[in-house]
Interface confidence: low
Amino acid sequence: SLGSLAAAEPAVIAECKTRTEVFQISRNLIDRTNANFLVWPPCVEVQRCSGCCNNRNVQCRASQVQMRPVQVRKIEIVRKKPIFKKATVTLEDHLACKCETIVTPRPVT
Amino acid sequence: SLGSLAAAEPAVIAECKTRTEVFQISRNLIDRTNANFLVWPPCVEVQRCSGCCNNRNVQCRASQVQMRPVQVRKIEIVRKKPIFKKATVTLEDHLACKCETIVTPRPVT
């Protein structure tokens, strides 16, 4: 209640909104044919929708997304020497979220 | 660079630090013996360590944690009528993070 403090605070729902998450940049995003390289940085921040909705029939989903290209280092190892190249990875940021009804497919009759 | 418009910005590492994450409050945290109830709210925000470290032999780990009790509603369904009770769930918040060496067990010889 307003002005009251209990030992265990009331749990507050994690509302459906964008939050900062960590996205791992996997090597196959850059080169599917070659495994003999490293990527720097190995992870970046992205904005993603998360949280809960009022009931179980609705889910927190992105209602607006934006693609964001970023430049990473592709570090190839050639004869034990690092060769630094540039590569572009396209990240997906969520800009807005909404609680959306889960459409379950009707059974075919 | 200053004055130029690059299509792709340099990727910035997601440093090892606490970020807000969503924690799903599962029913078995409250009552393992009875499944005939719902929990409200179904999810809450917690602080958790995430991000990357400088090399693959180190991992982002919590160096300081704090337990936080919160009060939730246990909604029991009795004769199709909802009965509202209170329950306490203890959440784990990460207060500080550090890049920690991964200790791999030595093979037994």
Epitope: L2, S4, A6, P10 | R73, F84, K86
Partner: antibody, heavy 120, light 107 residues
Framework: EVQLVESGGGLVQPGGSLRLSCAAS????????MSWVRQAPEKGLEWVST????????YYADSVKGRFTISRDNAKNSLYLQMNSLRAEDTAVYYC?????????????WGQGTLVTVSS | DIQMTQSPSSLSASVGDRVAITCRAS??????LNWYQQKPGKAPKLLIY???SLQSGVPSRFSGSGSGTDFTLTISSLQPEDFATYYC?????????FGGGTKVEIK
């Protein structure tokens, strides 16, 4: 200063309808659960209904279930109680009250009340 | 439903007296018990929540105790403005229920 001001009470015939309103100010209305509590003349307090902060969850006393509907408009900082199929036993002063968070289920701040009289 | 029984239903006391009002729940409600004060023609006012926590702005002469089924509201030194009706309320489960009230009158 927290203020809750009820309106909409009055004399109504049995079987009739009435809509009560509660205007809230002095606190972040959209963050708090809200309730209606009533008090029959010279009687004790009786819980009527509670609504969650976002309005998605509503709860009713058995005595009013199916006849009364609680609702809110967070943009207008207002709480409502739609009362249908009114009976003589619904005659009471109706108070709106702030009910805290998800797990409080108490009545922190109250309005001054509005009198509903059901009589032919 | 949880029944709340208050006793006494009324009492007479003098300014400066120590007054105790009891509230009994029909089943265990842990510490989910709240106390309210109501003066004639006025809205109730929250005094104590969670059995023993004093609501902000309430004088420290009011205190609450108890857990489970038996609870007590104590006024350590009755003041003229304390003559009113007091209600207990359980917030353990719905339907939310109040005690019948205790009227504190001037002796």
């Amino acid at each position: 200063e927290v203020q809750l001001v009820e309106s909409g009470g009055g004399l109504v015939q049995p079987g009739g309808s009435l809509r009560l309103s509660c205007a809230a100010s002095g606190f972040t209305f959209s963050s708090y659960w809200m309730s209606w509590v009533r008090q029959a003349p010279e009687k004790g307090l009786e819980w009527v209904s509670t609504i969650s902060d976002g309005g998605g969850l509503t709860y009713y006393a058995d005595s009013v279930k199916g006849r009364f509907t609680i609702s809110r408009d967070n943009a207008k900082n207002s709480l409502y109680l739609q009362m249908n199929s009114l009976r003589a036993e619904d005659t009471a002063v109706y108070y709106c009250a702030e009910s805290g968070g998800y797990t409080d289920w108490l009545f922190g701040y109250w309005g001054q009340g509005t009198l509903v009289t059901v009589s032919s | 439903d949880i029944q709340m029984t208050q006793s006494p239903s009324s009492l007479s006391a003098s300014v400066g007296d120590r007054v105790a009002i009891t509230c009994r729940a029909s089943q265990s409600i842990s510490n989910y018990l709240n106390w309210y004060q109501q003066k004639p023609g006025k809205a109730p006012k929250l005094l104590i929540y969670a059995a023993s926590s004093l609501q902000s702005g309430v004088p420290s002469r009011f205190s609450g105790s108890g857990s489970g089924t038996d609870f007590t509201l104590t006024i350590s030194s009755l003041q003229p403005e304390d003559f009113a009706t007091y209600y207990c309320q359980q917030s353990y489960s719905t339907p939310l229920t109040f005690g019948g009230g205790t009227k504190v009158e001037i002796k």
